[in-house]
Amino acid sequence: KESCDVQLYIKRQSYHSIFAGDPFKLECPVKYCAHRPQVTWCKLNGTTCVKLEGRHTSWKQEKNLSFFILHFEPVLPSDNGSYRCSANFLSAIIESHSTTLYVTDVKSASERPSKDEMASRPWLLYS
């Protein structure tokens, strides 16, 4: 029998290599049964995850999953870092793994490096 617990499908150690100035949607895939939980995004600051208030978010519904989306319009250098989504369900908090955004400022890069280059070249990244 399928579990009816809320599950958040963000992979551990996942990352996205993105460029300042581009739009980007960070998705939190959510599986639930009857009632959609309340979901929030936060950004890690050391070991603390600071809730993101007043940001543009939306829901997208697919066949077996819903996606809680955090919109970056556009991506800023300061958006570099790790993010986590959390679901509030039956007064319990379910936390996802964190996912990291590696932001490259295209003004400082002569050409757009590949995703793997960005993830392995921290001097291209903003802290």
Partner: antibody, heavy 119, light 112 residues
Framework: EVQLVESGGGLVQPGGSLKLSCATS????????IHWVRQASGKGLEWIGR????????KYAASFKGRATISADDSKNTAYLQLNSLKTEDTAVYYC????????????WGQGTLVTVSS | DVVMTQSPLSLPVTLGQPASISCRSS???????????LNWLQQRPGQSPRRLIY???KRDSGVPDRFSGSGSGTDFTLKISRVEAEDVGVYYC?????????FGQGTKLEIK
């Protein structure tokens, strides 16, 4: 039934290249990380790298960076390892392994494919 | 890189007796999510590796309950409460907290 089946091994000349395949079934490859690991005869396990078939992001061990390319085609539920500039020391059994990325719920290994680098 | 050190490297055991394998890492395997990503693999002779234990102590489905994992930080142990003939093979610890992921050298379990 869950299966990971590696293929593409065999005899390769030093300096040559190989491309190994790992055909998976019984789960959605996009929910996993695909690892490639090798084992020389009578030796231990050596991690080559890892691919996220959902987005193509890849990590490599330092000794394989620039020489190995790990990729996946989620439409075929298949992962690949390309290894260039082969040396005799690359002779080994090459395994793919698929580990669920969200909750660690499974970790499956293939049966391995033997690569022999020799002139 | 995180160095994984197993001991002993060879472990002769009498059938029905317990066995214990130690694995030490050169740095803590505690991830920032509060979990410790330490696996134990079994490789029987002529076969591919198989995951036995993940997250230090969680047994994979189909793994007999005579296998147990414990530990934290940098110090981990795999225990077999009563060794059976089918347990012969090489056991590896594997950390996937820090890149690059690394394996222990392996411990060869054989029957006395």
């Amino acid at each position: 039934e869950v299966q990971l089946v590696e293929s593409g091994g065999g005899l390769v000349q030093p300096g040559g290249s190989l491309k190994l395949s790992c055909a998976t079934s019984g789960f959605n490859i996009k929910d996993t990380y695909i690892h490639w690991v090798r084992q020389a005869s009578g030796k231990g396990l050596e991690w080559i790298g890892r691919n996220d078939p959902a987005n193509g992001n890849t990590k490599y061990a330092a000794s394989f960076k620039g020489r190995a390319t790990i990729s996946a085609d989620d439409s075929k539920n298949t992962a690949y390892l390309q290894l260039n500039s082969l040396k005799t020391e690359d002779t080994a059994v090459y395994y793919c392994a698929s580990y669920e990325g969200y909750y660690e719920r499974f970790g499956y290994w293939g049966q391995g494919t033997l690569v022999t680098v020799s002139s | 890189d995180v160095v994984m050190t197993q001991s002993p490297l060879s472990l002769p055991v009498t059938l029905g007796q317990p066995a214990s394998i130690s694995c030490r890492s050169s740095q803590s395997l505690l991830d920032r999510d509060g979990k410790t990503y330490l696996n134990w693999l079994q490789q029987r002779p002529g076969q591919s590796p198989r995951r036995l234990i993940y997250l230090v102590s969680k047994r994979d489905s189909g793994v007999p309950d005579r296998f147990s994992g414990s530990g934290s930080g940098t110090d981990f142990t795999l225990k077999i409460s009563r060794v059976e003939a089918e347990d012969v093979g090489v056991y590896y610890c594997w950390q996937d907290t820090h890149f690059p992921y690394t394996f222990g050298q392996g411990t060869k379990l054989e029957i006395k």
